[in-house]
Interface confidence: low
């Protein structure tokens, strides 16, 4: 069946619409479009003959219609009057007609709506406002948006029956709600600009800032008053009840304490006609100067004077505080504060008081602290000390004594030696001292402020250093069992102790060893060969000790009875005879051999080769010590045999004088002595 479709069905004014014929038969001769619901030649828009491709406009053609060979009708730039029905008449080649009717509607493009209000300045929580969506247009739907949300259900919002008017009740001051209206028809949707309500309110109680913090003299006072108000409030300032100015800010440069007082701000709303006031108290304090401390006594005497410290200057509305060694003042029996804390009294001040005192002044705008003050406490002098202490001094050294007494002010010093004034210095210096400088040294300390004196005495001893001692002897070569030896420790020294060592051992006194002359002389009675020493002497006093070099005694002794070796008495004929003689003696003895009474030789060894029986006889060894003047001898009888016989030994000794053998020996000794001196 032949039908007509409108594309689109609802057409916006000024746009175009296309009418399409559907189910058109084949083998068409042509077709004709009419305005309206029926075929009416007077309302023909145009026709189309397919075979000749001829399109002919009709009386209803406005110049905006275009007919196409596919049986479509395009109408451009449509107007409201184009709304309605359109009919197509299709003529087949058999000249049988077919008809169909279609339609469309034309709607205007809506303008952007806007909102009008019956009251632009409602008063909070009092006035209602009617908002109307303009313009009024036909076939239009009206919608409202509140804060970009669709209209909520609220007792404060009411719509008119056509939705074009929205009434808002009880509007609060902080209502920043945005209202928009929307218009709709089938071809357009438009939304207005947002509207917010200018709610009149206030003034509220004004606030003054900054708040009543203390102010410093010399600053400026700049107070700002603010009251929530619409329209903006007008402001009026009153100081202590007197009108000052009608500005939001009150500015007073370089304020003084006279600017303290009651500051009132009045806020006025010209629309609501209301007034509200707020009062603040302003206190102006002078900036405190740096304080300083004065004292009634700059030089107190220890444990005696009290000192009163005062914090200056005295200023109004000021709190005074004291600091002792950087610590807030604590309660003490030695410290006393005045009622206003401005004066601090210090009692019983000890000498070592290095306490520093500071005072602090405070008011609400400033805190200042003084420079520290310490007290100069007078004391002393204490008993002076002399240094170094009274150690003994060696003659030839320098004596340098220093005196010190704790004292403030510093003490003056005076030196006395053995009661005689020497000098007024802290140090006493004597170069190259002698024993004459020994004595009593007194230092006197004087404090010029307290007027006191104190003294101290020290004893100085000067000693001479001992020399190194040496030993002298009355006999360097004593003879054993005959001589006594006297050893003397030199030199003689006063106040000196003498000591002796024998064989590196302290001397043990015995009947043969005697000390005399204050131990300076050591006597050895009847020396023996074991008394050689070494001997040392030492001298000492309280300051030093010295020891001599060792000395040994050359004790002469002997000769002791000689010994002939070997001990054999019998020899074979033809053997060698080799006899050796030895005697203990100092100095070494002289040896002589006598055979059968005849002197043979002056040697310690007697040698005879290839002995025979002729060598039988008495062999005598004679020893002589020229230092002791003593001699000794021994005789050995030797037998020479041709046969074997057991050897034997026999010896005869002789010493001293009076025997024939000794007479011979004496004669030989003289001869020997004479021989050795030529």
């Amino acid at each position: 069946q032949l039908t007509i479709e409108s594309r689109p069905f609802n057409v916006a004014e000024g746009k175009e619409v296309l009418l399409l014929a559907h189910n058109v038969s084949q083998n068409l001769f042509g077709y004709i479009w009419y305005k309206g619901e029926r075929v009416d030649a007077s309302r023909r828009i145009g026709s189309c003959v397919i075979r000749t491709q001829q399109i002919t406009p009709g009386p209803a053609h406005s110049g905006r219609e275009t007919i196409d060979f596919n049986a479509s009708l395009l109408i451009q730039n449509v107007t409201q009057s184009d709304t309605g029905s359109y009919t197509i008449q299709v003529i087949k080649e058999d000249l049988v007609n077919e008809e169909a009717t279609g339609q469309f509607r034309v709607y205007p493009e809506l303008p952007k709506p806007y909102i009008t209000s019956n009251n632009s300045n409602p008063i909070e929580d009092k006035d209602a406002v009617a908002l109307t969506c303009e313009p009024e247009t036909q076939d239009t739907t009206y919608l409202w948006w509140v804060n970009n949300q669709s209209l909520p259900v609220s007792p404060r919002l009411e719509l008119s029956s056509d939705n074009r008017t929205l009434t808002v009740f009880n509007i609060p001051r902080n209502d920043t709600t945005s209202y928009k209206c929307e218009t709709q028809n089938p071809v357009s949707v438009r939304r207005s600009d947002p509207v917010t309500l200018n709610v009149l309110y206030g003034p509220d109680a004004p606030t003054i800032s900054p708040l009543n913090t203390p102010y410093r003299a010399g600053e400026y006072l700049n107070l700002t008053c603010h009251a929530a108000s619409n329209p903006t409030a007008q402001y009026f300032w009153f100081v202590n009840g007197t009108f000052q100015q009608s500005t939001q800010e009150l500015f007073i440069p370089n304020i003084t304490v006279n600017n303290s007082g009651s500051y009132m701000c009045q806020a006025h709303n010209s629309a609501t006609g209301l007034n509200r006031t707020t009062v603040t108290a302003i206190t102006v304090y002078a900036e405190l100067p740096k304080p300083y401390i004065t004292s009634n006594n700059s030089n107190p005497i220890e444990d005696k004077d009290a000192v009163t410290l005062t914090c200056e200057p005295e200023t109004q509305d000021t709190t005074y505080l004291w600091w002792v060694n950087n610590q807030r003042l604590s309660v003490s029996s030695r410290l006393e504060l005045s009622n206003d804390n401005r004066t601090l009294t210090v009692f019983n001040i000890p000498r070592n008081d290095t306490t520093f005192y500071e005072c602090e002044t405070q008011n609400p705008v400033s805190v200042r602290r003084s420079d520290p003050v310490t007290l100069n406490v007078l004391y002393g002098p204490d008993a002076p000390t002399i240094s170094p202490l009274n150690t003994p001094y060696r003659a030839g050294e320098n004596l340098n004594l220093s005196c010190h007494a704790a004292s403030n002010p510093a003490a003056q010093y005076f030196w006395f030696v053995n009661g005689t004034f020497q000098q007024s210095t802290q140090e006493l210096f004597i170069p190259n001292i002698t024993v004459n400088n020994s004595g009593s040294y007194m230092c006197q300390a004087h404090n010029s402020a307290t007027g006191l004196n104190r003294t101290t005495v020290t004893a100085i001893t000067v000693y001479v250093e001992l020399p190194k001692p040496y030993i002298s002897s009355n006999n360097s070569n004593p003879i054993e069992d005959k001589d006594a030896v006297t050893l003397t420790c030199e030199p003689v020294a006063e106040n000196t102790t003498y000591l002796w060592w024998v064989n590196n051992q302290s001397l043990s006194v015995s009947p043969r060893l005697q000390l005399s002359n204050g131990n300076r002389i050591l006597t050895l009675l009847s020396v023996t060969r074991n008394d050689t020493g070494p001997y040392e002497c030492g001298i000492q006093n309280s300051e030093s000790a010295k020891r001599s070099d060792p000395v040994t005694l050359n004790v002469t002794y002997g000769p002791d009875t000689p010994i002939i070796s070997p001990p054999d008495l019998s020899y074979r004929s033809g053997a060698n005879l080799n006899l050796s003689c030895h005697s203990d003696s100092n100095p070494s003895p002289q040896y002589s051999w006598l055979i059968n009474g005849t002197l043979r030789q002056h040697t310690q060894v007697l040698f005879i080769s290839k002995i025979t029986s002729n060598n039988n006889g008495a062999y005598a060894c004679f020893v002589s010590n020229l230092a002791t003047g003593r001699n000794n001898s021994i005789v050995k009888n030797i037998s020479v045999s041709s046969g074997d016989s057991a050897p034997g030994s026999s010896g005869l000794s002789a010493s001293g004088s009076g025997s024939g053998l000794n007479d011979i020996f004496e004669a030989q000794k003289i001869e020997w002595h004479h021989h050795h001196h030529h």
Epitope: N212, T213, E219, V365, V367
Partner: antibody, heavy 120, light 107 residues
Framework: ELQLVESGGVLVKPGGSLKLSCAAS????????MSWVRQTPEKRLEWVTY????????YYPDTVKGRFTISRDNARNTLYLQMSSLKSEDTAIYYC?????????????WGQGTLVTVSA | DIQMTQSPASLSASVGETVTITCRAS??????LAWYQQKQGKSPQLLVY???TLTEGVPSRFSGSGSGTQFSLKINSLQPEDFGSYYC?????????FGSGTKLEIK
């Protein structure tokens, strides 16, 4: 909008020196008393120093006296803190603060802070 | 120097509860006391000064009281945004000193 922005905080060795700056905007800087306040790693708040609006009056606690110096350049809207002879106990976040207009009392406005670390 | 002693050092509470933080001055500071709130990683913010005056924008559930040496900060009906650290500070002349802080945590 009143704004305080601190800068200059770094790691510094004990005994060293450092200068912090605070740039102010959005208010009449030359009319406000200013202070530096620091917050230690243990979260304790300590007032460091104060300067009045004209720059003629300064205060310091004993802990920093003689080592720190506060100054301001009202033409440049900038507050400074010169720190010397730094000690490990000076490690903290340093805040630039403005007092209420005409007041030297509470710290009404604070910057975001700058970290100073004193360590060998 | 004036010492400020704050208690408790820490406090756990639930949303909706009421809490009180106290601060004691070592000497009379009249009404020269401020309270600050500090949230994690942020700068301290002034809540109250002159002992009881609320800074502009601070909710009315906060209130300060006291004078002389004893002060307190009360928070009614705790909200989630109230958790953090609170410090008291005297502004009665230099040196200004702070309390050691109270950490308010969610229970």
């Amino acid at each position: 909008e009143l704004q305080l922005v601190e800068s200059g905080g770094v790691l510094v060795k004990p005994g060293g020196s450092l200068k912090l700056s605070c740039a102010a905007s959005g208010f009449a800087f030359s009319s406000y008393d200013m202070s530096w306040v620091r917050q230690t790693p243990e979260k304790r708040l300590e007032w460091v120093t104060y300067i009045n609006s004209g720059g003629g009056i300064t205060y310091y606690p004993d802990t920093v006296k003689g080592r720190f110096t506060i100054s301001r350049d009202n033409a440049r809207n900038t507050l400074y803190l010169q720190m010397s002879s730094l000690k490990s106990e000076d490690t903290a976040i340093y805040y630039c603060t403005a007092h209420y207009f005409g007041s030297s009392g509470p710290f009404a406005y604070w910057g975001q802070g700058t970290l100073v670390t004193v360590s060998a | 120097d004036i010492q400020m002693t704050q208690s408790p050092a820490s406090l756990s509470a639930s949303v909706g509860e009421t809490v009180t933080i106290t601060c004691r001055a070592s000497e009379n500071i009249y009404s020269y006391l401020a309270w600050y709130q500090q949230k994690q990683g942020k700068s301290p913010q002034l809540l109250v000064y002159n002992a009881k005056t609320l800074t502009e924008g601070v909710p009315s559930r906060f209130s300060g009281s006291g004078s002389g040496t004893q002060f307190s900060l009360k928070i009614n009906s705790l909200q989630p945004e109230d958790f953090g650290s609170y410090y008291c500070q005297h502004h009665y002349g230099t040196p200004f000193t702070f309390g050691s802080g109270t950490k308010l945590e969610i229970k």
